[in-house]
């Protein structure tokens, strides 16, 4: 159990050639139970924790007190392999035919029962004391999961039979347990890389290679860090793991000098109204660096002299803005750059983009109103107001008249056309005030509206009337 | 992290009888082997035995045999030796260590210490 | 009984030098199946002992490479290519080939 002893890798129908363990009859075939073997181990299980007991256990029925004490036979205690070899052991067990029950022989690795993916046999051997039960177990190319400490255990009356374990040491190539990573840095400054790996066999050593030549002459010991004092170029580093079984190597991973990004490309109108414009683009390359946040420049196009370009910042992403507090019907060239830790790109290309017209920026002027008491129609003229070009061209008016009287409340509204400057729209309410303002329309919406000019209409013939379209609030004149 | 915690010092008299134990953490308690290593004070290192806590098989060097008893429980993942007849030949530090797959003894108990004195 | 003679008992070395321990079996500690279950250990003062080398000459998980192992058969030797002050306790030789286990009597690694 605790020495170590002679183990060869044989071929199964080879591994009991010489003499087998304990009692075993001449002139008996073997007959076989192979365990079946699945294609995957189940999920990990918890291994059962099981009171200790000796290898000979007493057992305390009256029955059995008579019988001989069994246990597992000594065999090898540790193996020692590389990977994808091929493995096989054994544990063997004489039971005499005193024991009545037995059941069959099951394979454990470091507390857990081995359900599957690997190849067991139990060979029985009868004869007239007993019968001897050989557990072969083989592993086809073995791998690093396969360490651990492989045991037996079998029900024998009841009592559960424990062999002494064999240790399976699988030795192989250097594996890589961290490895260098892809870092974007600042040019000329230091940084680390890491790279560690593991055997068994220990101990496992690192060489870096740069750019397919090794940095370091010595080679260090797992885990390695190098430090790089400054890179000018992009460079690709990787590292060597060796150990007593040969050399693995890392991936490769490259090293980029961060530099200012690319210029925004793509730049598009997505939407334009009379004082903004929604821009979008697509970022440039971010030159191995994030995008901090772009700046939009706007200038107006129509200008001869160099007229000054506004700059509005925003974060990089989402890549879209909306310019606003530009003039109506005006031409703009637009430009973006965006910038990383390490500068400013240089602009895009430059796009011409449109605001669409205005509404008036002035109500109409010199409202009058006056009662058509013939026709029972008020009588409304106005001049039109001064609208510039980015106002948009006219399309008309827009007249608002709001009529009170005790207990009546009465707002209406008329479009009118552009033609002329006058409208008549007819009584409403007698005995009331009416409030009537005026705002002119373009094709870019409506302007606002006129001072309110308040009228009297009387029950009978008498009317106030206000000709100016600004007077004081409740300011009214007589005609 | 694999991990054997041992108990604390003992103070016994002549002729008593002492048990210390060694508590596993980290790993399959009944997959490996535990030895037992006596060291006196100033002086070297003994190998006292061993026990496979999986089926409780035991070894010992003959030198111990009958002067320490080897057990263990693996409902608590504790190992124990129980020392009987104490002297003061018997004073020493006692350590636990695990024999690991690269068969030595990789991970060991901080130790305990035993003084046999009247 | 495979008696391990250690060699020597104490070695006073300066800090970077090197230091060198010899370990004898009165019997060969080869197995048959080819391993050679021979160990080096350092137990530091107050402290439980560590393994440094296992099987001759492989070192254990987290043992810098400033210590190696060589020798086969019945003669071994520990060296530590360059002393530091970390590295003072004492050095043991352990064989597990042959039962019972036996320890080399230890060398006391100190400076001068």
């Known amino acids: 159990g605790g020495t170590a002893e002679k183990w060869e890798e044989t071929e199964l129908d080879q591994l009991f050639s010489g003499p087998l363990p304990g009692r075993l009859p001449v002139n008996h075939r073997p007959f076989s139970a192979p365990h079946s073997s699945r294609d995957q181990l189940p999920p990990p299980q918890t291994g059962r924790s099981h009171p200790a007991h000796t290898a000979a256990p007493q057992v305390t029925s009256t029955a059995s007190k008579l019988l001989p004490p069994v246990a597992f036979n000594h065999t090898i205690g540790h193996i020692v392999l590389s990977e994808h070899k091929n493995v096989k052991f054994n544990c063997s067990i004489n039971i005499p035919n005193t024991y009545q029950e037995t059941a069959g022989i099951s394979w454990w690795k470091d507390g857990k029962e081995l359900l599957g993916a690997h190849h067991s046999i139990t060979q029985f051997y009868p004869d007239e004391e007993g019968v001897s039960i050989i557990a072969l177990f083989s592993i086809a190319s073995v791998q690093r999961s396969d360490n651990g400490s492989y045991f037996c255990k079998m029900k024998v009356n009841n009592r559960e039979i424990v062999s002494d374990p064999i240790y399976v040491e699988v030795q192989g190539l250097p594996y890589f347990i961290k490895q260098p990573e892809s870092v974007n840095v600042t040019r000329n400054t230091a940084f680390n890389l890491t790279c560690q790996a593991v055997g068994p066999p220990e101990p496992v050593n690192i060489f870096w290679v740069q750019n397919s030549s090794r940095v370091n002459e010595k080679p260090e010991r797992s885990p390695s860090v190098l430090t790089v004092p400054g890179l000018t170029e992009t460079a690709v580093f990787s590292c060597e793991a060796h150990n007593d079984k040969g050399l693995t190597v890392s991936k490769g991973v490259h090293i980029n000098i961060k530099v200012i990004p690319s210029p925004p490309t793509e730049v598009h109108i997505l939407n334009s109204t009379a004082h903004s414009i929604l821009v979008s683009w697509v970022p440039g390359f971010d030159g191995y660096s994030p995008l901090q946040n772009c700046s939009i420049q706007v200038k107006e196009a129509d200008r001869l002299s160099n007229g000054s370009v506004m700059v509005f910042n925003t974060s990089a992403s989402p890549h879209l803005y909306e310019i606003q507090q530009l003039q109506a019907l005006a031409n703009y060239s637009i430009a973006v750059s965006c910038r990383n830790e390490i500068g400013w790109s240089a602009v895009s290309p430059w796009i011409l983009a449109s605001t669409t017209e205005g509404a008036p920026s002035v109500a109409p002027l010199n409202i009058t109103v006056f009662l058509n008491e013939s026709n029972n129609i008020l009588d409304i003229r106005w001049t039109k107001p001064p609208i510039k070009r980015q106002d948009g061209e006219l399309v008309g008016y827009r007249i608002s008249h709001v009529w009170e009287s005790a207990g009546t409340y009465k707002e209406l509204s008329e479009e009118v056309s552009q033609n002329g400057s006058w409208a008549q729209i007819p009584v409403q309410i007698h005995n009331a005030t009416c409030t009537v303002r005026i705002a002119a329309i373009t094709k870019g919406g409506i302007g606002p509206f006129s001072e309110p000019v308040n009228i009297i209409i009387p029950e009978h013939s008498k009317v106030d009337y206000a000709p100016s379209s600004t007077p004081a609030p409740g300011n009214t004149d007589s005609m | 992290q694999d991990q054997l915690q041992q108990s604390g010092p003992e103070l016994v008299k002549p002729g008593a009888s002492v048990k210390i134990s060694c508590k596993a953490s980290?790993?399959?308690?009944?997959?490996?082997?535990i030895h037992w290593v006596k060291q006196r004070p100033g002086q070297g290192l003994e190998w006292v035995g061993w026990?496979?806590?999986?089926?409780?098989?035991?070894k010992y060097n003959e030198r111990f045999k009958g002067k320490a008893t080897l057990t263990a429980d693996t409902s608590s993942s504790t190992a124990y030796m129980q020392l009987s007849s104490l002297t003061s030949e018997d004073s020493a530090v006692y350590y636990c260590?695990?024999?690991?797959?690269?068969?030595?003894?990789?991970?060991w108990g901080q130790g305990t210490s035993v003084t046999v004195s009247s | 009984d495979a008696v391990m003679t250690q060699t020597p008992l104490s070695l006073p070395v300066s800090l970077g030098d090197q230091a060198s321990i010899s370990c004898r079996s009165s019997?060969?500690?080869?197995?048959?199946?080819?391993?050679?279950?021979l160990h080096w250990y350092l137990q530091k003062p107050g402290q439980s002992p560590q393994l440094l080398i296992y099987?001759?000459?492989n070192r254990f998980s987290g043992v810098l490479d400033r210590f190696s192992g060589s020798g086969s058969g019945t003669d071994f030797t520990l060296k530590i290519s360059r002393v530091e002050a970390e590295d003072l306790g004492v050095y043991f030789c352990l064989q597990v080939t042959h039962v019972p286990f036996t320890f080399g009597s230890g060398t006391k690694l100190e400076i001068k």
């Open positions: 099987r001759v000459s």
């Open positions: 026990i496979f806590p999986g089926n409780g098989n035991t």
């Open positions: 260590a695990r024999l690991g797959l690269i068969y030595a003894l990789d991970y």
């Open positions: 019997q060969s500690l080869e197995n048959s199946n080819g391993n050679t279950y």
């Open positions: 980290g790993y399959s308690f009944t997959s490996y082997y």
